[in-house]
């Protein structure tokens, strides 16, 4: 059995332009102890979307539902949607260290824009 | 019935050791982080030592870390503190605590008695 | 270390009036808008139980006379009306990313 799981149950979400878009993510355990990050795209160029520590992400919000009893809730929102955010987000659990240790990614969220 | 059952516990000088154990019941014992939270009359409680639900990832405060040992074996349901170089300031009870998420302490054993004493 | 300060250390309230607990950290214990703040009641010669998760979630088969609230660093503990079988030593604690989970030092509540 895994030690932890990190889920993103939808596989795609399409938003209208200028809607908001949420994402979401749970994480069975936090055990290991670290943080959680959002990035945009896979490899060493993916983007950092959301990183709760440092950075400033003036478009997404943290909309997690805390009364989840058997997980983890770090879903994200992002505001005002254009057509140069589409692509695939995914939410990633890291073990705490010097520096830090990516654990285990989400499946990742694809994200498709529609025209208003 | 979640049942946490500690037992190990007793009186012992400074610089021993003791092996604290916890049978769980009633829960998929596999699935769950275990930790030890301990209690004193005068420091109240304090968080001991936490162990991922898989056994890779263990957790303990400087209070005791390199003197403490926690693990577990998923196939007997059991959870177990090795506890080393003992001191005055470990005397407490010892609570065995399971956890769903690794976050609350959601599920507390009855406690056993550890006393370090010359 | 996150230093978890809880107050009072004791209480007396009347039978069906609010007993209300504080407990402030050091910094915050949030996350992704989950506040990781917990509570727990611990009755003599009992281990404690948990009573309320996450700032504010009630565990399965409390009372919905205890409600907890509360965010980031400052939260409270309600219990509304005080019942008889709620004489108890109530505890919070922080279980943050940041190491080591620490509690707060207890509140006795007792029957005035």
């Known amino acids: 059995e895994e030690e932890l799981q990190v889920i993103q149950p939808e596989k795609s979400v399409s938003v209208a332009a200028g809607d908001s878009a949420t994402l979401n993510c749970t994480v069975s355990s936090l055990i290991p102890v670290g943080p959680i990050q959002w990035f945009r795209g896979a490899g060493p160029g993916r983007e950092l979307i959301y990183n709760l520590k440092e950075g400033h992400f003036p478009r997404v919000t943290p909309v997690s539902d805390p009364t989840k009893r058997n997980n983890m809730d770090f879903s994200i929102r992002i505001s005002n949607i254009t057509p140069a955010d589409a692509g695939t987000y995914y939410c990633v659990k890291f073990r705490k260290g010097s520096p830090d240790v990516e654990l285990k990614s989400g499946a990742g969220t694809e994200l498709s824009v529609r025209a208003k | 019935e979640v049942q946490l059952v500690e037992s190990g516990g007793g009186l012992v000088k400074p610089g021993g050791s003791l092996r604290l154990s916890c049978a769980a019941s009633?829960?998929?014992?596999?699935?769950?982080?275990m930790s030890w939270v301990r209690q004193t009359p005068g420091k109240g409680l304090e968080w001991v030592a936490t162990?991922?639900?898989?056994?890779?990832?263990?957790y303990y405060p400087n209070s005791v870390k390199g003197r403490f040992t926690l693990s577990r074996d998923n196939a007997k349901n059991s959870l177990y503190l090795q506890m080393n170089s003992l001191r005055a300031e470990d005397t407490a009870v010892y609570y065995c605590?399971?956890?769903?998420?690794?976050?609350?302490?959601?599920?507390w054993g009855q406690g056993t008695t550890v006393t370090v004493s010359s | 270390d996150i230093v978890i300060t809880q107050s009072p250390a004791s209480l007396a309230v009347s039978l069906g009036e609010r007993a209300t607990i504080s407990c402030r950290a050091s910094?915050?214990?949030?996350?992704?808008?989950?506040?990781?703040m917990h509570w727990y009641q611990q009755k003599p010669g009992q281990p404690p139980k948990l009573l309320i998760y996450?700032?504010?979630n009630l565990e399965s088969g409390v009372p919905d006379r205890f409600s907890g609230s509360g965010s980031r660093t400052d939260f409270t503990l309600t219990i509304n009306p005080l019942q008889a079988e709620d004489v108890a030593t109530y505890y919070c604690?922080?279980?943050?990313?940041?190491?080591?989970?620490?509690f707060g030092g207890g509140t006795k509540v007792e029957i005035k």
């Open positions: 910094e915050s214990v949030d996350s992704y808008g989950n506040s990781f």
């Open positions: 604690h922080q279980s943050s990313e940041q190491l080591p989970w620490t």
């Open positions: 162990i991922s639900s898989g056994g890779t990832y263990t």
């Open positions: 996450r700032a504010s």
């Open positions: 009633g829960f998929t014992f596999s699935s769950y982080v």
């Open positions: 605590v399971s956890s769903m998420t690794g976050s609350s302490f959601d599920y």
